[in-house]
């Protein structure tokens, strides 16, 4: 690792669309790119009516937004397509949803986030 | 440094085949997807074939499937399109194009284009 | 497939301008979404990927937003050789599909 971040090598590898495009559905993925960029995995996926649909995970380009992230997490509220991304090998296994809460006026009533969803 | 020189294209009868060649050099060739791109004359880019880092996984655009095939032999730093049935609306400049994942196919390197006319 | 629309297909800018294209994809594309930039005679070059990561390279005054279906590229302050066509270009399903592209010209 380098100045102690954990650098990723591999990444989980699914793909709901292995037929069409003729890939393997899930195992591992090695991730290459050149020696000045930096590696993460990533998973995107789907809830519909309350069921979690993943629909890829693998390695993602050097990306700032995935920086220093040890976990998965999406954080934008309610999008269409979940996205998250992480680094370190096989970070993208379990993957959440925890959006940010935009905070307009403090208030003495804490607010609870959305629960989670967890591959 | 990143070079993608392609190679092959020319004038060509409709029915007629080519087969064009990308030479890769300045990075490890079997480490990353590569694609060809085609843009016909004054027209926009159009994604033609896309090939992982060690040639498992393969796609193509529907304009082209059955017809061309994409290849790449990594011992010779080599991509190939194989164009067979060629027809008028294929004439365009080709492209090869670099990408890190089969998944994230953001185009990072491009050669600068080889011209393949289809004309009788 | 998945339909990218730009817009507009050309405008005309002064050197010194901010310039703004946009493009909508025809369903969810989450952050699958790229910049290219293309002079005449030349290859295209990456310019943003991932929707707001710069490629090696590309300047500052170049940046991405957007998510999910639309997508912006703002030139903050439009240089001469910044005067080209540019594509935005999705990666999220098979088979990639490029925008129609925005050509920028000189005013």
């Known amino acids: 690792a380098i100045l102690g971040r954990s650098e990723t090598q591999e990444c989980l590898f699914f793909n709901a669309n292995w037929e069409k495009d003729r890939t393997n559905q899930t195992g591992v993925e090695p991730c290459y790119g050149d020696k000045d960029k930096r590696r993460h995995c990533f998973a995107t996926w789907k809830n519909i009516s309350g069921s979690i649909e993943i629909v890829k995970q693998g390695c993602w380009l050097d990306d700032i937004n995935c920086y220093d992230r040890t976990d998965c997490v999406e954080k934008k509220d309610s999008p269409e397509v979940y996205f998250c991304c992480c680094e370190g090998n096989m970070c993208n296994e379990k993957f959440s949803y925890f959006p940010e809460m935009e905070v307009t006026q403090p208030t003495s009533n804490p607010v609870t986030p959305k629960p989670p969803y967890y591959n | 440094e990143v070079q993608l020189l392609e190679s092959g294209g020319g004038l060509v009868q409709p029915g007629g085949s080519l087969r064009l060649s990308c030479a890769a050099s300045?990075?490890?060739?079997?480490?990353?997807?590569m694609n060809w791109v085609r843009q016909a004359p004054g027209k926009g880019l159009e994604w033609v074939a896309g090939i992982n880092y060690n040639g498992g996984y393969k796609g193509y655009a529907d304009s082209v499937k059955g017809r061309f095939t994409i290849s790449r032999d990594n011992s010779k730093n080599t991509l190939y399109l194989q164009m067979n049935s060629l027809r008028a609306e294929d004439t365009a400049v080709y492209y090869c194009a670099r990408s890190a994942n089969w998944h994230d196919t953001a185009l990072d390197y491009w050669g600068q284009g080889t011209l393949v006319t289809v004309s009788s | 497939d998945i339909q990218m629309t730009q817009s507009p297909s050309s405008l005309s800018a002064s050197v010194g301008d901010r310039v703004t294209i946009t493009c909508r994809a025809s369903?969810?594309?989450?952050?699958?979404l790229n910049w290219y930039q293309q002079k005449p005679g030349k290859a295209p070059k990456l310019l943003i990927y991932a929707v707001t990561s710069r490629a090696s390279g590309v300047p500052s005054r170049f940046s991405g937003s957007g998510s999910g279906t639309d997508f912006t590229l703002t030139i903050s302050s439009l240089q001469p050789e910044d005067f080209a066509t540019y594509y935005c270009q999705q990666s999220y399903d098979s088979p990639l599909t490029f925008g129609g592209g925005t050509k920028v010209e000189i005013k």
């Open positions: 369903q969810s594309i989450s952050n699958y």
């Open positions: 300045g990075f490890t060739f079997s480490s990353y997807g």
